[in-house]
């Protein structure tokens, strides 16, 4: 009955401060209305980092004030998360929720690992 | 901080109607699915209804579908219960829950009682 | 629909003891959705533990959950007078979401 989350380890951000990872879901049945949670866990916290209902076969629409955008492919969906800096560095958990139609399932990844490295400030040059 | 505030239980006459109210604060309400749990007196926890974030899905327990209907208003942060033709065995305290970002309960609120009988 | 069957019903122990609570599940529950509840006389139940093993917070951890597939265990170290009451595992990975009948833990 549980539905299967698969997700990456270890992801790591982009020196302009951007992570894409692929969450994976095992569906149980044929759903047509999916939610898609990217939620960050720090010290047993989680907070909400961006979410979209898609229905199968469309697009992800996050927010428009969203840091993530991304797309969908069957049962995999590609995120991807902008604007990140090393302080922004935990536990990224994708969680899955097959809305519609019943029964409604319900799935959490093991969380991918990002790593955000400020870069350098480039030297002055005359 | 997090509360969820129940009301409108009472008593009623079996065969009529009662809606219950559960109010929440302390978060952003449009971000969380919501549940209704209840307990018969003397008994243990119950599962009634789900609502999704937008209210547009809602899951009922077999003892309630077609007489129950669950639905939100975002706008007030307010979740509701429109509980028709109630029956002697839907005598309960009455819980709006709200689900984790990980899938428990993870807040409840006080409980309203709904008593019906003859 | 996933039952949940509790036991045992109801465990005696005094204060200080080990309590060992049961929970099966009639078919195989993720262990990232399995929950335990506490609930006291006149009160709202409270999150204990969720994801089979996780302390919601504020909860002490005397309080520890184990288990997997369709056996899980809700184990309270020592118990303090305030731990005696009523409680309940959850299902919470597909609808319906199904609750345990409970175990009641009272002073012997």
């Known amino acids: 009955k549980a539905m299967h989350v698969a997700q990456p380890a270890v992801v790591l951000a982009n020196s302009r401060g951007t992570a894409s990872f692929v969450c994976e879901y095992a569906s149980p049945g044929k759903a047509t209305e999916v939610r898609v949670t990217v939620l960050r866990q720090a010290d047993s916290q989680v907070t909400e980092v961006c979410a979209a209902t898609y229905m199968m076969g469309n697009e992800l629409t996050f927010l428009d004030d969203s840091i993530c955008t991304g797309t969908s492919s069957g049962n995999q969906v590609n995120l991807t998360i902008q604007g990140l800096r090393a302080m922004d560095t935990g536990l990224y958990i994708c969680k899955v929720e097959l809305m519609y139609p019943p029964p409604y399932y319900m799935g959490i990844g093991n969380g991918t690992q990002i790593y955000v490295i400020d870069p350098e400030p480039c030297p002055d040059s005359d | 901080q997090v509360q969820l505030v129940e009301s409108g239980g009472g008593v009623v006459q079996p065969g009529r109607s009662l809606r219950l109210s559960c109010a929440a604060s302390g978060f952003t309400f449009s971000s969380y699915t919501m549940h209704w749990v209840r307990q018969a007196p003397g008994k243990g926890l119950e599962w009634v209804t789900f609502i999704s974030y937008d209210g547009n899905n809602k899951y009922y327990a077999d003892s309630v579908k077609g007489r129950f209907t669950i639905s939100r208003d975002n706008s007030k942060n307010t979740l509701y219960l429109q509980m028709n033709s109630l029956r002697a065995e839907d005598t309960a305290i009455y819980y709006c829950?709200?689900?984790?970002?990980?899938?428990?309960?993870?807040?409840w609120g006080q409980g309203t009682l709904v008593t019906v009988l003859e | 629909e996933i039952v949940l069957t509790q036991s045992p019903g109801t465990l005696s122990l005094s204060p200080g003891e080990r309590a060992t609570l049961s929970c099966r599940a009639s078919q195989s529950v993720g262990s990232s959705y399995l929950a335990w509840y506490q609930q006291k006389p006149g009160q709202a139940p409270r999150l204990l533990i969720y994801g089979a093993f996780s302390r919601a917070t504020g909860i002490p951890d005397r309080f520890s959950g184990s288990g997997s597939g369709t056996d899980f265990t809700l184990t309270i170290s020592r118990l303090e007078p305030e731990d005696f009451a009523v409680y309940y595992c959850q299902q919470y990975g597909s609808s319906p979401w199904t609750f345990g009948q409970g175990t009641k833990v009272e002073i012997k």
């Open positions: 829950a709200r689900t984790g970002w990980l899938g428990p309960f993870d807040y």
